[in-house]
């Protein structure tokens, strides 16, 4: 067959409509004309094109092609002529003030905040050179400059991640069923069963030493005693493979030694050697029958009609002549649309093609990052470029702790808590919010003062039973919480001053809650008999179930606002899964009884997902797109529960519709709640009243008794419509008509007595500090039987 990319020797042929005929008579899709790509391969599709001027935000390649300015000198050639990465272009590049130069031999600029963060972002590691010691006196500084509590040094675990905390340690004695690598040389301890198992477990390979294992070392090519049977070949890397696999063209040994030292040209003179090394009779070469296993005896045989010589066979790109007929194929990044024409593959249809933004181009795609993030050119992931270093904040029943994700230093934010499970943060104000199940209170404090019991403000300390989930709406300044004892979901202003029950029906065991103030939605998990994940507007409108199948004990949920996906952990199914905000595109990222023994809290940031696990008493992380790269961030944590990321990019600024309105608080007398932004016609907010009051016909003022009006109806999230006469205390949709798409009717429980002899701050009996059962059932015993209640938590 002829060169498939050459065309035009045959008679002229008209191209189909929607195609452009090249000078060489190839046919290409018309849309490829004047797109700055030589698709014809004779440049005729790019001739006589109007001169293009690049935008100010673009870089003009030497050949006139336009690319984004930010792609210049990014280590990848985007200009067809490579001029965006040329020495001339990049050496004259000066890094802006907020960027750091990677040194004189590099033209790369990285965000200044990446300096001394423990990750080498410059090729030569210039961003990590000469960094000062950051660790406190009682901490150990790892080789990668992360900080570690001194207790973790020489404990047998690689806590630094680079092994530096375990170097130069006094040799611990190996256990009774362990083997010391390197003999008396002070090597690591490995299980005895790993010795002489044909796998190198010791760095010095001493566990497979010939004198120890009673056989030649794994380096021998094929010593008879090296493998169990004579029909096996001993790889130099220690394993045994089938003898027939030796010199068969496939690399079966880890070190490929089964294909080393193989004789070349082993076929006889009357034989043809196939591509895979096997031999067939020479007469079978080019006999129009495939005799070699790989078909190489018929490759390159010229006979019959070569359709590719005529108009490239009608193929838009590659034409391959076959024994019978021909075949059109496409270069990388393209796929056949109609057996002949190649069209671009939209790699961006795969939601995991990029960590953030995917931009599809003809024949390739490019990953980009949202504002505030920058592409790490080494990992190709988007990393936070702005603000302080991110940290993880988590609860462990009696404390709230913090781990700096860059320096890896570990601190206690709030000590001496009775039974804290849920928490959240407000980054802009540097505040932390938490619920204590024993005190039955929701608290708040400034992060730097949170350890001081005098500074812990009480937001909610009435009509609270078991607040297990908490979320802060940082835009509209509200807190939302679930109460598994009262079986309610409520909202209050961040100072606790104004509150309302949003849902009091169809909740069994509500647990985690998360909010999306940018779009006006909240999401929560319920691990009751009919376990589910639900969603509604932040005003309680449009309640819907997102997940109800293949779900058992959904504990933590978290939102990735950028990719618009919800992640959750299921402690019964031992799974970490995600869905989009509409409940579609469900993915199980990790399914593991080891890493997800009893997961509780979950958080997402950059390219990672983090979760707490009660049984492992640890915090894990993994790649949020594919669930790979699972690692332990912290262990021996004693009941780690809720977990959040503290970083400004987790809480993007957005307008508060209630404050943007002409009247303060949206004109609402009590609560102004954001409405879900379902369409461009969606109301921006609705007004709401306390649980014991009713909204008037103006949809703004609150009244002790329902106002009689024929025009006002309440559309309940449960029953859709109720007559005006049975109107409940309500929230409203702010519209010109009095259509009240409201929350469900709260069930008004008996009033709490005004005088109680003993406050709801039950004592802790040590026996009930941990979950009620050893296998971490979903229930906790609340620590005071006098209160007559149990608090449930995973």
């Amino acid at each position: 067959a002829a060169d498939p990319l050459l065309g035009g020797q045959g008679p002229a042929k008209d191209c189909e409509k929607d195609q452009f005929q090249c000078r060489n008579e190839r046919c290409i899709p018309s849309v490829w004309r004047c797109d700055e790509d030589d698709d014809c391969l004779d440049h005729s599709d790019e001739d006589d094109c109007p001169k293009k001027t690049c935008a100010d935000s673009d870089f003009t390649c030497d050949n006139g092609h336009c690319i984004h300015e930010r792609w210049k000198c990014d280590g990848e050639e985007e200009c067809p002529d490579g001029s965006d990465e040329s020495e001339a272009t990049c050496t004259k590049q000066v890094c802006p003030a907020e960027k750091l130069s990677c040194g004189p031999t590099s033209h790369k600029c990285v965000p200044a905040s990446w300096r001394c963060d423990g990750e080498k972002d410059c090729e030569g590691g210039a961003d990590e050179a000469g960094c000062a010691t950051l660790c406190a006196p009682h901490e150990f500084q790892c080789g990668n400059r992360s900080c570690l509590a001194a207790v973790f040094v020489c404990d047998g675990d690689d806590d630094c991640g680079d092994g530096s905390d375990e170097r130069g340690c006094a040799d611990p004695a190996c256990g009774p069923r362990e083997f010391r690598c390197g003999g008396d040389g002070g090597g690591a301890c490995i299980p005895e069963r790993w010795v002489c198992d044909r796998q190198f477990d010791c760095e010095d390979r001493s566990d497979e030493a010939a004198e120890l294992c009673g056989r030649p070392g794994p380096g021998a090519t094929s010593a008879p005693a090296a493998c169990a049977t004579a029909s096996q070949f001993a790889c130099r890397s220690g394993e045994c493979v089938h003898l027939g696999w030796r010199c068969d063209g496939d690399r079966d040994c880890k070190d490929k030694s089964d294909e080393a030292d193989c004789p070349l040209g082993t076929c006889r003179g009357d034989e043809f050697q196939c591509g895979d090394g096997t031999c067939v009779l020479a007469i079978k070469h080019c006999n129009q029958e495939q005799d070699c296993p790989d078909g190489s005896d018929e490759a390159g045989c010229l006979q019959g009609l070569n359709e590719c010589l005529h108009n490239n066979g009608g193929c838009s790109h590659i034409c391959t002549d076959l024994k019978i007929g021909f075949e059109c194929t496409c270069p990388a990044g393209f796929q056949l649309l109609d057996q002949k024409t190649c069209g671009d593959i939209d790699e961006c249809k795969d939601p995991d093609a990029c960590s953030q933004i995917c931009v599809n181009y003809k024949g390739y795609f490019k990953c980009e990052c949202y504002p505030g993030y920058e592409m790490d050119l080494l990992t190709k992931n988007c990393k936070a470029a702005a603000g302080k270093s991110p940290s993880l904040i988590f609860t462990n029943r009696h404390e709230v702790r913090r781990i700096d994700l860059v320096k890896r230093n570990y601190s206690r934010l709030i000590p001496m808590l009775k039974n804290v499970v849920a928490l959240d943060v407000e980054v802009a104000t540097n505040r932390i919010y938490w619920c204590d199940l024993s005190y039955r209170k929701i608290y708040s404090a400034y992060m730097d003062k949170a350890s001081d019991p005098k500074e812990q403000e009480v937001l909610i300390d009435e009509q609270l039973h078991s607040p297990e989930g908490l979320a802060v709406d940082w835009v509209h300044k509200h807190i939302y919480w679930t109460d598994s004892g009262n079986k309610t979901i409520s909202v209050a202003t961040v100072d606790g001053g104004r509150r309302r029950t949003l849902f009091s029906r169809n909740l069994s065991e509500p647990r985690a809650i998360a909010v999306d103030p940018l779009r006006g939605f909240m999401y929560w998990s319920d691990w009751g008999d009919q376990a589910k994940i639900e969603k509604s507007g932040l005003n309680g409108v449009d309640r819907q179930t997102l997940v109800s199948d293949n779900i058992e004990w959904p504990n933590g949920i978290t939102l990735d606002l950028l990719s618009q996906r919800l992640y959750w952990v299921d402690s019964k199914l031992h799974q970490l899964s995600s869905i989009d905000f509409s409940g579609g595109n469900r993915k199980t990222l990790i399914s593991s009884t080891d890493f997800l023994s009893h997961p509780f809290g979950i958080a997402v940031f950059e390219d990672k997902v983090f979760w707490t696990d009660l049984e492992n008493e640890a915090i894990f992380s993994a790649n949020r797109l594919n669930g790979l790269e699972i690692s332990i961030l912290a262990e021996n944590l004693n009941n780690p529960h809720d977990i959040v990321i503290f970083h400004e990019l987790k809480q993007p600024r957005a307008p508060d519709a209630c404050e943007l309105s002409v009247q303060p608080n949206g004109g609402c007398e009590y609560l102004c709640l954001p409405a879900p932004q379902i369409s461009s016609h969606s109301p921006k907010y609705t007004c709401a009243c306390p649980d014991t009051m009713w909204l008037g016909p103006d949809m703004k003022r609150c009244y002790r008794a329902p106002q009689s009006t024929s025009t006002t109806t309440l559309a309940s999230t449960m029953t859709r419509t109720v007559p005006a006469t049975t109107r409940a205390p309500g929230t409203t949709v702010h519209r010109s008509t009095y259509q009240n798409h409201s929350t469900e009717t709260p069930s008004l429980t008996a009033a709490v007595p005004s005088s109680v002899s003993v406050p709801r701050a039950p004592s802790i009996s040590p026996s009930t500090l941990s979950p009620a059962t050893s296998n971490h059932s979903q229930h906790y015993a609340n620590e005071d039987s006098k209160m007559g209640s149990t608090v449930t938590a995973a």
Partner: antibody, heavy 117, light 107 residues
């Protein structure tokens, strides 16, 4: 700066009533539970009552239950203690307190209540 | 209610001396213990919370220790301004209760 100023103390006959007030300033009054603690002359300290942030929950020591009522007005940043059926053993300096978690964080200067015929 | 037994009821110390005051709870209070100093004619001031955390502005010669049911307040290098009554208070469970107080005088 946190300031708590008590008023309303004085001499009162047994069986009569008296109302103490406490004006709070320098902090978000509605964000903290408030309490009254008393100290009889040359005696130790004794917790009397606590009120929750919005006034919905009140807690009392057994000896004053049914006679004393603690309340608050968040709009006025004021704490109250209504004392009825006063007894001679109620004689003490009464301190207005901003509670902290598990402790009494800030104390007023105190107001003396003397129950005597 | 949890009873708090404080000892001694009173003690006197010389300038620069180290003194200790003990507080015994009738049940485990898990370090939810605070110490207050009350000077004559004044209201009590918080010194130490959570058994061993020093309140801001309190001199470092004051220190708290203990766990379970037994706690102590130590004042090293006694100063004239340290005279007064010291109270312990448990915050583990309502009703919060105080010890009877210890009167500290300068010799």
């Amino acid at each position: 700066e946190v300031q708590l100023v008590e008023s309303g103390g004085g001499l009162v006959q047994p069986g009569r009533s008296m109302k103490l007030s406490c004006a709070a300033s320098g902090f978000t009054f509605s964000s903290f539970p408030m309490a009254w603690v008393r100290q009889a002359p040359t005696k130790g300290l004794e917790w009397v009552a606590t009120v929750s942030t919005r006034g919905g929950h009140t807690y009392y020591r057994d000896s004053v239950k049914g006679r004393f009522t603690i309340s608050r007005d968040n709009a006025k940043n004021t704490l109250y203690l209504q004392m009825n059926s006063l007894r001679s053993e109620d004689t003490a300096t009464y301190y207005c307190i901003r509670e902290g978690t598990s402790l009494f964080a800030y104390w007023g200067q105190g107001t003396l209540v003397t129950v005597s015929s | 209610d949890i009873q708090m037994t404080q000892s001694p009821p009173s003690l006197s110390a010389s300038l620069g001396e180290t003194v200790s005051i003990e507080c015994l709870a009738s049940e485990d209070i898990s370090n939810y213990l605070a110490w207050y100093q009350q000077k004559p004619g004044k209201s009590p001031q918080l010194l130490i919370y959570y058994a061993n955390s020093l309140e801001d502005g309190v001199p470092s010669r004051f220190s708290g220790s203990g766990s379970g049911t037994q706690y102590s307040l130590k004042i090293s290098n006694m100063q004239p301004e340290d005279e007064g009554v010291y109270h312990c208070q448990q915050g583990y469970n309502y009703p919060y209760t105080f010890g009877a107080g210890t009167k500290l005088e300068l010799k």
